[in-house]
C-alpha cells in the first residue's frame, strides 16, 4: 500500500482491544482545504514505542487504514480511497507493548466536516439569576454551533454540560455557579447540524470565583502611640487564599479576591469625613482615637461578608500638657501646638458615660502663638463642659482634616467643668483631738478627686482666733486627713480646707471652730 492511500488490507498487528485506561481519544477529522483532510487525536499514556493507525470503514462495509507511526495527526487527500461525500466511520488503533488500544469511533461526512475552533479570546463571565453566564464572540465564519462545557472544582473531577445550539455572532452559555468554591470551565464547539462532526479542542480555562467571596480571616494589632501621636495598625494574619482547581493555579484571572480595608474613625464626630477605604496591604497610621476597621472581601460578582474589629481609643493621659484658664468671658485651653496651619479637634465627654455622648469642636486652621501654643476658647453661654463634673478631653490635630489617616493625637487629659473651684470644695470637715497639742482634721474627698490628675493638692488652713495667726498645710491629693500639731490648749481655732487644681485655686470650706481643752492635773 502507498503511504498516501488508505490501505484496504488487514493491519500489521492482531485485532484485539486491550481495554486499558490509556490509549487514543478525542479523534477529530475535518476538511482543511478544497481537497485535503486532517485527522488528529490525543494519546493518553507512555508514548515510547507506540504506533498509531487511523482506521476507516466505508458505508459499503469495506475498511482500510493509514499508518501514522508515532504521530497523532494525519493528512490525506480526497484521492486516498476514503469516500468524502458519504458517511464514513473512523477510529484510531494504537499498537503498543504487544497490545491494541482503540479510540471511540466518529461517524461523519468528511466533505461537510469543518474544523471548528473553541471560543477564542475574551470570554465574559457574569452572574444571571444565580447562574453563571459566559459569552464570547463567535469565531470567524463559524456561525452555527453546538457548544459543550466541562467544569471542575478543586475537589471534584470534570463534569460535562451542554450549552445548546448557537446561531449568532455572539454565543453564550448558562452554567452552574458554586456558592463557596472556585471552578474551572472549558468550552468546546462543533458544527451545528452536521451529523457526527468533530468537536473542537477545549478552550483555555475560564476560572470562576465562588458566588460568595471567602470571609477574610485576619487579625490586627495596633502599636503604641508614638511621639507624633500616631500608632501603626498592623496585620497579624494574611487573608486565606482561595483554593483553586488545577488549571487555575498560578495565574488565574477571574478568581481573584480583593481585600480592602474600611476605616471608620469614631472619635471626633464633628470632622468632615469619618470613613476611608484603603488597600489591605497599605496599613495606615492612626491617631489614638477609637476606630472600627472592616475588611471587605469582593470578587468579580461583588462584595462578600465583611469582618469588623473595634480598635479602642488610646487612654494614656498627659496630666500637664493642657493649660486651662477660666475667666469672666469664658474658658480658654492652651496646649503645645503641633505645626503651622493645623486644624484641631477638641473632643470631650463626661467620665463614666457612654462614648457615644462625646461632643467635639473643630478649630479653623491655626498657627502657633508666639509662645508656641495652640488655643481653643468657649463662652459660658455655649454650655461646653458647663456641668460641674469630670470630663475626659482629647485633642486631635491634622494639617489635612479631610484625610482620615492624617489625624494625630495631641493629648488626652481630664478636666473638671463648670465652677470647679466651688464644686471642688471639700465637705464634712471634722476635727478630733489627737494629743495634748494636736488634732486630726478629716474631710470628705473633693469632687475634683474623681477627675484623674485634676486635683493638685488640698490646702488646710488653721487660724488662731486670739493672735489671728494663720498657718497653711499642703496635703497630697490622695490624702483626706492631716494632723495639726503645736496647738495651745484653751485657744480657739478655726480650720478650713480647699482643693486646688493646677490652674485654679479652690474655695475654702466653711470654717470649723475647735479648741483643745485645758487639762487640769489632780
Amino acid at each position: 500500500c502507498r503511504t498516501s492511500e488508505c490501505c484496504f488490507q488487514d493491519p500489521p498487528y492482531p485485532d484485539a482491544d486491550s481495554g486499558s485506561a490509556s490509549g487514543p481519544r478525542d479523534l477529530r477529522c475535518y476538511r482543511i482545504s478544497s481537497d485535503r483532510y486532517e485527522c488528529s487525536w490525543q494519546y493518553e499514556g507512555p508514548t515510547a514505542g507506540v504506533s498509531h493507525f487511523l482506521r476507516c470503514c466505508l458505508s459499503s462495509g469495506r475498511c482500510c487504514y493509514f499508518a501514522a507511526g508515532s504521530a497523532t495527526r494525519l493528512q490525506f487527500s480526497d484521492q486516498a480511497g476514503v469516500s468524502v461525500l458519504y458517511t464514513v466511520t473512523l477510529w484510531v488503533e494504537s499498537w503498543a507493548r504487544n497490545q491494541t488500544e482503540k479510540s471511540p469511533e466518529v461517524t461523519l461526512q468528511l466533505y461537510n466536516s469543518v474544523k471548528y475552533e473553541p471560543p477564542l479570546g475574551d470570554i465574559k463571565v457574569s452572574k444571571l439569576a444565580g447562574q453563571l453566564r459566559m459569552e464570547w464572540e463567535t469565531p470567524d465564519n463559524q456561525v452555527g454551533a453546538e457548544v459543550q462545557f466541562r467544569h471542575r472544582t478543586p475537589s471534584s473531577p470534570w463534569k460535562l454540560g451542554d450549552c445548546g445550539p448557537q446561531d449568532d455572532d455572539t454565543e453564550s452559555c448558562l452554567c452552574p455557579l458554586e456558592m463557596n468554591v472556585a471552578q474551572e470551565f472549558q468550552l468546546r464547539r462543533r458544527q451545528l447540524g452536521s451529523q457526527g462532526s468533530s468537536w473542537s479542542k477545549w478552550s483555555s480555562p475560564v476560572c470562576v470565583p465562588p458566588e460568595n467571596p471567602p470571609q477574610p480571616q485576619v487579625r490586627f494589632s495596633v502599636e503604641q502611640l508614638g511621639q507624633d501621636g500616631r500608632r501603626r495598625l498592623t496585620l497579624k494574619e494574611q487573608p486565606t487564599q482561595l483554593e483553586l482547581p488545577e488549571g487555575c493555579q498560578g495565574l488565574a484571572p477571574g478568581t481573584e479576591v480583593t481585600y480592602r480595608l474600611q476605616l471608620h474613625m469614631l472619635s471626633c464626630p464633628c470632622k468632615a469625613k469619618a470613613t476611608r477605604t484603603l488597600h489591605l496591604g497599605k496599613m495606615p497610621y492612626l491617631s489614638g482615637a477609637a476606630y472600627n476597621v472592616a475588611v471587605i472581601s469582593s470578587n468579580q460578582f461583588g462584595p462578600g461578608l465583611n469582618q469588623t474589629w473595634h480598635i479602642p481609643a488610646d487612654t494614656h493621659t498627659e496630666p500637664v500638657a493642657l493649660n486651662i484658664s477660666v475667666g469672666t468671658n469664658g474658658t480658654t485651653m492652651y496646649w503645645p501646638a503641633r505645626a503651622q496651619s493645623m486644624t484641631y479637634c477638641i473632643e470631650w465627654q463626661p467620665v463614666g458615660q457612654d462614648g457615644g455622648l462625646a461632643t467635639c469642636s473643630l478649630t479653623a486652621p491655626q498657627d502657633p502663638d508666639p509662645a508656641g501654643m495652640a488655643t481653643y476658647s468657649w463662652s459660658r453661654e455655649s454650655g461646653a463642659m458647663g456641668q460641674e463634673k469630670c470630663y475626659y478631653i482629647t485633642i486631635f490635630a491634622s494639617a489635612h482634616p479631610e484625610k482620615l489617616t492624617l489625624w494625630s493625637t495631641v493629648l488626652s487629659t481630664y478636666h473638671f467643668g463648670g465652677n470647679a473651684s466651688a464644686a471642688g470644695t471639700p465637705h464634712h470637715v471634722s476635727v478630733k483631738n489627737h494629743s495634748l497639742d494636736s488634732v486630726s482634721v478629716d474631710w470628705a474627698p473633693s469632687l475634683l478627686s474623681t477627675c484623674p490628675g485634676v486635683l493638685k493638692e488640698y490646702v488646710v488652713r488653721c487660724r488662731d482666733e486670739d493672735s489671728k495667726q494663720v498657718s497653711e498645710h499642703p496635703v497630697q491629693p490622695t490624702e483626706t486627713q492631716v494632723t495639726l500639731s503645736g496647738l495651745r490648749a484653751g485657744v480657739a481655732y478655726t480650720v478650713q480646707v480647699r482643693a486646688d487644681t493646677a490652674w485654679l485655686r479652690g474655695v475654702w470650706s466653711q470654717p470649723q471652730r475647735f479648741s483643745i481643752e485645758v487639762q487640769v492635773s489632780d
Epitope: R232, H279, Y285, L406
Partner: antibody
C-alpha cells in the same frame, strides 16, 4: 514644607547607565512608599517602579518595559530615593518624577529631572 | 494591566463653562482613582483622590464622582488658570496606570 528634589539626570548614550536621586524633606520619609513616574516628551505619564517602606518589607515592583534594567532603592537615614537605570534605550528618554505612593497619606511629586538617551 | 480610557483627548470651552472629563477603567477599581492637573513644564498636581475627595487647598469648582469602572471629573465653572492637561490614575493595582490625558483650552 514638603519637598522632593530629583537630581542625576542628563544625556547618556544607548546602553549606558545613570543613577537618579530624590532628596525628601518635610515628611516621615521612612514611612512612605515611593514611586518613580516618567513622561516622554509630549506624551502622557507612565509609572516606572515602586519601593515599599522598610516596615512593609521594602519590596520593589517595576513596570514591564523597565524590569530587569532599572532598580529602585532607598536610604532612609539620608531621606533619599534612588533609581538606577542600566542598558538605557532611546525610548527611556523622559522627565522622571519621584512621587509618594497614591492612596497613601500624601501625594507629593518632585519637579522632575530630564533624562535623554541619544547617540 | 488595568487600562484607563480617558475622553475627550482635548476640549475647548469658554470661561464659566462647565467642563466634564470621563475615565473608564478596564476592570473594577473601587474608588482608587486620582485626578491630576498638569501645566506645561510642571509636575502633576493632585486635585481629587479616592475618586471624589477634594485635596486640601484645591478650589471647590473641581469635583469627581464614580466608582467601579466609570468616573467623571468636572470643572463647574472654567477659569483661565484651569488651562492644563488633566489625567486620571488608578491605584487599585500594579502597574499604576494613567489615562491618556485631556488637554483643556479656552475658546
Amino acid at each position: 514644607e514638603v519637598q522632593l528634589v530629583e537630581s542625576g539626570g542628563g544625556l547618556v548614550k544607548p546602553g549606558g547607565s545613570l543613577r537618579l536621586s530624590c532628596a525628601a524633606s518635610g515628611f516621615t520619609f521612612s514611612n512612605a512608599w515611593m514611586n518613580w513616574v516618567r513622561q516622554a516628551p509630549g506624551k502622557g505619564l507612565e509609572w516606572v517602579g515602586r519601593i515599599k517602606s522598610k516596615t512593609d518589607g521594602g519590596t520593589t515592583d517595576y513596570a514591564a518595559p523597565v524590569k530587569g534594567r532599572f532598580t529602585v532603592s532607598r536610604d532612609d537615614p539620608k531621606n533619599t530615593l534612588y533609581l538606577q537605570m542600566n542598558s538605557l534605550k532611546t525610548e527611556d528618554t523622559a522627565v522622571y518624577y519621584c512621587t509618594t505612593d497614591p492612596g497613601w497619606e500624601f501625594d507629593y511629586w518632585g519637579q522632575g529631572i530630564l533624562v535623554t538617551v541619544s547617540s | 494591566d488595568i487600562q484607563m480610557t480617558q475622553s475627550p483627548s482635548s476640549l475647548s470651552a469658554s470661561v464659566g463653562d462647565r467642563v466634564t472629563i470621563t475615565c473608564q477603567a478596564s476592570q473594577d477599581i473601587s474608588n482608587f482613582l486620582n485626578w491630576y492637573q498638569q501645566k506645561p513644564g510642571k509636575a502633576p498636581n493632585l486635585l481629587i483622590y479616592d475618586a471624589s475627595d477634594l485635596e486640601t487647598g484645591v478650589p471647590s469648582r473641581f469635583s469627581g464622582s464614580g466608582s467601579g469602572t466609570d468616573f467623571t471629573f468636572t470643572i463647574s465653572s472654567l477659569q483661565p488658570e484651569d488651562i492644563a492637561t488633566y489625567y486620571c490614575q488608578q491605584y487599585d493595582n500594579l502597574p499604576l496606570t494613567f489615562g491618556g490625558g485631556t488637554k483643556v483650552e479656552i475658546k
